[in-house]
Interface confidence: low
């Protein structure tokens, strides 16, 4: 039989992946009012759109952007000024420094005089008018107007010691997930900020080789498990009279302050009411504290009867983070996601006490995020529809009605193409954009907030669709398997001409970290897509115990014993896949990055003989080496009277002997600020001491993402060669 001439499709190449040939676009409106938004066009003009009048025009030209090499912008709420951001210099995951220029839209020129210093660590407009708050050299400054001289709010800032308005390393990565730690009140009168004191925190130091004769040493205050943590204080300053009284400290709830604690988030409720969330160092108790400004005392008061305690008896509080409240119009009651009596995370309405909370959603699924609460509607996302944990649909609850009614806004819009949505709402949800991430090609659409009617397609990835027409893409399946009362969802990526009667090599891609999810109904063309398309490898991703959105019983199974069930469940899944009949038992590999590198390492060292080879990129090797907030959330403290024993038992090094019968490729960036090179150095040392042969690759001066173009190309090429050799696939 000759292949039909019509089948001219080609397989993906590694080059396609490394060049980002098949990357998709999303469209998030930058809302500036109920019906107006900005968007950066393909040619870098900043364009203004009015949904109702249909008008659109360039408010900031690409030539203006180019004149200062700007890559980002921010419009002041009074629409008089735009900040232009250039000289982007990445620091950690979210943080970066940049140079900022202020452009006067009315004058059509840059504001001269009292220019901003450089580089700035964070800058933002007030929510009203055109006040500017910025952080420079760890101190916060305020400008009432862009052309005004700055007023220095804090003086304590000191590199690697005191951070004002920006988080230190551990808070940025493990608690706030932002580059900032300051928040304007809705009317721009008050500015709340956090001061992080890292003076007593041990330093992680590593070499950065650069091009010099001597390497530089990077020093980061980084609390590992059990170490001294940052000391946090929250302050609020009146920006109208910033040194009239000076910053006022917000009191910490007594039950929190009695031992080590964390600040977890701040939410402004109204112009003189703020909500702070705190967490005990043992992260099973969270306190939400509502505080009011007392004009007479010129202080912030947080009455005990406005403290709401959230406690977990089976694990840690919240999901990955403790959820934040969505306040209703009365500025007193709020909606919040937390576990119900059955251990599923659901929306609750709190008016006075948590004990009297009204449960708004319920079922054996989870509410994931509250997008917006308006006078008459609450919009949220969940994985309820058709019982697939890896889907996200947007729902509206009409809270104005009695009784409230629930409607799925997205479930039936483009059912095959779109099963995983997020949304972006205008101020009071008069309009919103839906961004669908898959499983088909991503698409972004604009909708009427009252009728949910689609108004316009914002981005449908037509070019990508056309360029994929002649590509042989693998087939993707999302299914579940059952084992002894447990259900594991998996995603399988099958080669284009998949034939069940044949045998294929299998690569397990694992992450498996607590409260993560790998099996999602999203579109992707990446390295594993290439491996299936071109190299004929079956890829599988499995969400084992400890992963999210399937209830606390499944999530909290790993509490205080990381490295056990995550690995066990990957092994169980592999055995089930072998039973399916199309997997070549002699050619099974596993790979993972970060937490996935930890799990892949432990799986390879499980002694089961299931895996021929595997790769660990930037793995954690001991929870004692990782950040306090993360490690302790799931493992407790590495002390004799707490959980030191499991800290010791769960290391990769403890299993060095078991690597003898597998091919192991260990990879790490030497400038990894997150999972320190130390982790891989210790694995390598243990393997050498055990006289176990292994392969390794380091990437000089690369961080946890190994993301520089050259490094990434080298990394994926190297891993591809390793895998093909392992699977005896010809080059």
């Amino acid at each position: 039989l000759r292949p039909s001439r019509g089948n001219t499709k080609r397989a993906l190449t590694l080059k396609d992946i490394l060049n980002g040939t098949f990357s998709y676009k999303t469209y998030f409106p930058n809302w500036i009012s109920e019906q107006e938004y900005l968007h950066q066009s393909e040619d870098d003009n900043i364009v203004f759109y009015n949904i109702e009048t249909r008008e659109s025009y360039i408010i900031l030209s690409n030539s203006t952007m180019k004149s200062v090499n700007a890559t980002d912008y921010g419009l002041s709420p009074d629409r008089q000024f735009v900040y232009l951001e250039s000289d982007y210099s990445k620091l950690w995951r979210y943080s970066y420094t940049a140079t900022y220029y202020i452009y006067d839209l009315q004058n059509g020129e840059f504001v001269r005089g009292y220019e901003l210093p450089r580089p700035i660590q964070y800058l933002c407009w007030s929510p009203v008018g055109s006040k500017l708050a910025y952080v420079y050299q760890n101190n916060i400054y305020l400008k009432q107007r862009p052309g005004d001289p700055p007023f220095q709010i804090t003086y304590t800032g000191r590199e690697n010691r005191i951070f004002n308005g920006i988080p230190d390393w551990v808070y940025e990565e493990e608690m706030l997930a932002t580059k900032y730690a300051l928040w304007w009140s809705p009317d721009g009168k008050f500015l709340a900020y956090v001061e992080f004191n890292d003076s007593d925190i041990p330093i992680i130091a590593y070499s950065y080789y650069g091009d010099g004769q001597y390497p530089r040493t990077i020093n980061i205050p980084y609390p590992k498990a059990g170490a001294k943590n940052p000391v946090v204080r929250v302050f609020i300053v009146d920006t109208t009279y910033p040194h009239h009284v000076g910053p006022m400290e917000v009191p910490v709830p007594e039950m929190i302050a009695s031992s080590d604690y964390y600040f977890s988030w701040l939410t402004w409720v109204s112009s003189e009411r703020v909500c702070l969330q705190w967490l005990k160092r043992v992260q099973n108790v969270s306190v939400l504290s509502i505080c009011d400004f007392r004009e007479d005392w010129h202080a912030w008061e947080c009455p005990k009867n406005q403290e709401h305690v959230e406690e977990s008896r089976t694990g840690w509080a919240g999901g990955f983070f403790v959820s934040t409240p969505a306040f209703s119009q009365d500025a007193t009651s709020y909606y919040k996601i937390f576990s119900d009596k059955d251990g599923y995370k659901h929306i609750h309405y709190i008016k006075d006490t948590v004990e009297n909370a009204i449960q708004i959603t319920s079922g054996k699924w989870e509410a994931i995020y509250i997008f917006r609460v308006t006078q008459d509607s609450l919009f949220y996302s969940s994985n309820e529809f058709e019982g697939y944990p890896g889907r996200r649909n947007i729902y509206r609850i009409s809270i104005g009605n009695s009784p409230p009614s629930k409607k799925c806004v997205t479930c039936h819009l483009r059912k095959e193409r779109c099963q995983y949505y997020t949304a972006s709402f205008s101020y009071k949800a008069k309009y919103y954009a839906l961004v669908c991430y898959g499983p088909g090609l991503p698409i972004s659409t604009l909708h009427d907030g009252r009728t949910d009617q689609e108004i316009q397609v914002l981005e449908e990835n037509k070019e990508l669709e056309n360029s994929l027409r002649n590509i042989q893409l693998p087939k993707v399946e999302i299914k579940k398997l059952k084992d002894g009362g447990l259900t594991f969802w998996y995603k399988m990526i099958l080669p284009p001409q998949f034939d069940r009667s044949k045998k294929y090599p299998l690569l397990i891609q694992v992450y498996g970290g607590p409260c993560s999810q790998s099996v999602k109904s999203v579109f992707a063309v990446n390295w594993i897509t290439y491996l299936a398309s071109k190299e004929g490898i079956v890829i599988a991703l499995v969400d084992g115990r400890g992963t999210a959105f399937q209830g606390d019983k499944f999530l909290h199974a790993v509490y205080r014993k990381l490295g056990v069930y995550e690995v066990e469940d990957q092994l169980t899944a592999v055995r089930k896949f072998i039973e399916m009949g199309f997997i070549d038992e002699e050619r099974i590999a596993i790979w993972g990055w970060s937490y996935g590198g930890y799990v892949s390492s432990l799986a390879l060292a499980s002694g089961t003989g299931l895996f021929k080879c595997g790769i660990a990129v930037a793995p954690v090797s001991s929870w004692e080496y990782y950040a306090s907030i993360y490690s302790e959330r799931f493992m407790g403290l590495p002390t004799k009277d707490d959980n030191l024993e499991h800290y010791k038992n769960s290391t990769v090094m403890a299993r060095a002997e078991y690597f003898r019968n597998v091919d192991y490729l260990l990879i790490h960036g030497t400038a990894d600020d997150n999972v320190h090179f130390q982790n891989s150095a210790q694995i390598a040392k243990a393997l050498v001491n055990a006289q176990v042969d292994f392969q390794a690759m380091w990437y000089s001066d690369q961080n946890h993402g190994i993301s520089s173009g050259r490094s990434q190309n080298h990394l994926y090429t190297h891993m591809t060669h390793f895998l093909k050799q392992c699977f005896s696939l010809s080059d």
Partner: antibody
Framework: DVQLVESGGGVVRPGESLRLSCAAS????????MTWVRQAPGEGLEWVST???????????YYADSVKGRFTISRDSSNNTLYLQMNSLRAEDTAVYYC?????????????WGLGTLVTVSS | EIVLTQNPGTLNLSPGERATLTCRAS??????LAWYQQKPGQTPRLLIY???TRATGIPDRFSGSGSGTEFNLTISSLQNEDFAVYYC??????????FGGGTKVEIK
């Protein structure tokens, strides 16, 4: 009640010096920008100089081009007094000099004004 | 520097009439514009700041409007005590702080 009382005006010859004072009361002096504004006989208002704190005891001063290098604004927060040291006076400096308090810490509009003190520069 | 031009220079009106004073800026003053009233032999008195916010104790017959480069002060019904000189002042882009040349409101 907010009160601003200027003093120190008088008749001087061109090239001579004068020091104006403004005694302030009824508000926290250090928290507000303070300004000198003048008005030549029969003319409009003209901004002369502003002083304001920038926190930590540092002060910022600003001058109109016409007086830069000749006039110096200062304040003594311990006795709530604003000063304007005027050197190398010229005939065109003849005016009523008003001391004015800013409406907020930041904004330089003026919610309270003194009654003014007359400076005459004449040969 | 921002030059403020006030029109008209003089406004002749009778008590009870509506007065509209204009202040034009050579470049945007944003919303940072104030109006003052000055009677002969007296000190200036703040009427309006931030374009349209009345100062403490100012009667509601005084109102401000505009933004950017064009601003108005309106006195809805002139009272005898309102006959005076009115100055606008910008504090958006300074130094220098600048005043308009003034508009004199006279009794017709």
């Amino acid at each position: 009640d907010v009160q601003l009382v200027e003093s120190g005006g008088g008749v001087v010859r061109p090239g001579e010096s004068l020091r104006l004072s403004c005694a302030a009361s009824g508000f926290i002096f250090r928290n507000y920008a303070m300004t000198w504004v003048r008005q030549a006989p029969g003319e409009g208002l003209e901004w002369v100089s502003t002083i304001r704190s920038s926190g930590s005891g540092r002060t910022d001063t600003y001058y109109a081009d016409s007086v830069k290098g000749r006039f110096t604004i200062s304040r003594d927060s311990s006795n709530n007094t604003l000063y304007l040291q005027m050197n190398s006076l010229r005939a065109e400096d003849t005016a009523v000099y008003y001391c004015a308090k800013s409406g907020t810490f930041w904004d330089t509009f003026f919610d309270y004004w003194g009654l003014g003190t007359l400076v005459t520069v004449s040969s | 520097e921002i030059v403020l031009t006030q029109n008209p220079g003089t406004l002749n009106l009778s008590p009870g009439e509506r007065a509209t004073l204009t202040c034009r800026a050579s470049q945007s003053a944003g919303r940072n514009l104030a109006w003052y009233q000055q009677k002969p032999g007296q000190t200036p008195r703040l009427l309006i700041y931030d374009v349209n916010t009345r100062a403490t104790g100012i009667p509601d017959r005084f109102s401000g409007s505009g933004s950017g480069t064009e601003f108005n002060l309106t006195i809805s019904s002139l009272q005898n005590e309102d006959f005076a000189v009115y100055y606008c002042q910008q504090y958006n882009n300074w130094p220098p702080l600048t005043f308009g040349g003034g508009t004199k409101v006279e009794i017709k």
